[in-house]
């Protein structure tokens, strides 16, 4: 029972990663920032992994897409293969995981092939999970390092004057989503691969225990004696026979007080 | 690198009208927001007006109800129309042009500047 909720929790917690992953990759708001300001109208600018927008205080909005831009940054491309593979990733093992739940019945499904395939889910969540977290880590840090390196200065270029404006910017929402999305995926993961555990069937041999009357080589199964419950096909209390047969692991047995003569 | 091109400066008379234009040309993501600045003789660089991309527009007080800033956004043009000229408005005109970069700081550059002067 423990099992099977915690294979049911990692998959549902898996999923919620999962959708929040795919929702931070589409977001616009990966970081924002004030592009202009004066006392009547402010421009402010949210971007995200593909495309640009700006938002004037009057109301006008209007976004446009990197596709038009030469030279993106190489770590722009990073972080979107990175969320990419983590949505990728993760979508497949969804999918592996849904097959893999206890509480679904395909066929005549072993244990075994359910264990495995939830440790493979598992794995991929958590593989997922830290795309996600790697690849807005990596994003933050862009940022972060974009604006320090450009501190205002001033250089003539062709046509007259070039000046880099330092402007406040802040961590977008999406960042926050893709952080919080990617380590519930991971620990959905976590979750499954635990669970797998659980649902991993045990090599357990259950060995008759062999007891001897003193003097005789005869061995009595377990259930040999039975009380008087009625039950059973041994309600008269007869001896059954076992022919001296003995476990593997049993070398030699010696008489205890608890032998029954 | 963003080229820009200012034209219509020349000498006025007083009480006279005139059109500057600044053209934005090269490779840049977007313009955000377009402007004329102004330097006389002697003095700092002054704010005349500004306009966003979506038309907001602002005029310094000294400008104000006597020039008219207007862009073509396809263009990337902006125009600075001034009327009821004065003395006091003699100066180099600069066309100021802020470009988003992404993931980046924006740029501001400016033109050369065209000469305004206002004399009978």
């Known amino acids: 029972m423990a099992v099977t909720a915690c294979q049911g929790l990692g998959f549902v917690v898996s999923l919620i990663g999962i959708a929040g992953i795919i929702a931070a990759t589409c977001m616009d708001q990966w970081s924002t920032q004030d592009l202009y300001n004066n006392p009547v109208t402010a421009v402010f600018n949210y971007q995200g992994l593909w495309r640009s927008c700006v938002r004037e205080s009057s109301g006008f909005t209007e976004c446009r897409g990197y596709f038009t831009l030469l030279g993106l940054p190489a770590m722009l491309q990073a972080v979107r293969a990175l969320m990419i593979v983590g949505i990728v990733l993760g979508a497949i093992g969804l999918l592996v995981s849904i097959f893999a739940l206890k509480c679904i019945r395909i066929g005549s499904m072993e244990d075994s092939a359910k264990a495995n395939m939830t440790l493979t889910s598992g794995i991929m969540f958590i593989v997922s999970g830290l795309c996600a977290i790697a690849g807005v880590s990596v994003f933050a840090n862009m940022l972060v390092t974009n604006f320090w390196m450009s501190t205002a200065n001033m250089y003539t270029g062709m046509g007259g004057m070039v000046q880099t404006v330092q402007t406040r910017y802040t961590f977008g929402a999406a960042l926050f989503v893709g952080w919080v999305a990617g380590g519930l995926t991971l620990i959905g993961g976590v979750m499954m691969c635990i669970a797998c555990r659980g649902l991993a069937p045990e090599e357990t041999n259950y060995k008759a225990v062999s007891y001897h009357a003193s003097g005789h080589s005869v061995a009595y199964k377990p259930g040999g004696f039975k009380a008087s419950t009625g039950f059973g096909s041994n309600t008269k209390n007869k001896k059954i026979y076992d022919g001296g047969a003995r476990t593997e692991d049993e070398v030699q047995s010696y008489p205890s007080k608890h032998d029954y003569v | 690198e963003v080229q820009l091109v200012e034209s219509g400066g020349g000498l006025v008379q007083p009480g006279g009208s005139l059109r500057l234009s600044c053209a934005a040309s090269?490779?840049?993501?977007?313009?955000?927001?377009m402007g004329w600045y102004r330097q006389a003789p002697g003095k700092g660089r002054e704010l005349v007006a500004t306009?966003?991309?979506?038309?907001?527009?602002y005029y310094a007080d000294s400008m104000k109800g006597r020039s008219t800033i207007s862009r073509d956004n396809a263009k990337n043009t902006v125009y600075l129309q001034m009327n009821s000229l004065k003395p006091e408005d003699t100066a180099v005109y600069y066309c100021?042009?802020?470009?988003?970069?992404?993931?980046?700081?924006?740029?501001?550059?400016w033109g050369q500047g065209t000469l305004v002067t206002v004399s009978s």
């Open positions: 100021n042009v802020r470009v988003e970069v992404p993931f980046m700081q924006p740029n501001d550059y």
């Open positions: 090269g490779s840049f993501f977007r313009i955000v927001a």
């Open positions: 306009i966003t991309r979506g038309g907001s527009t």
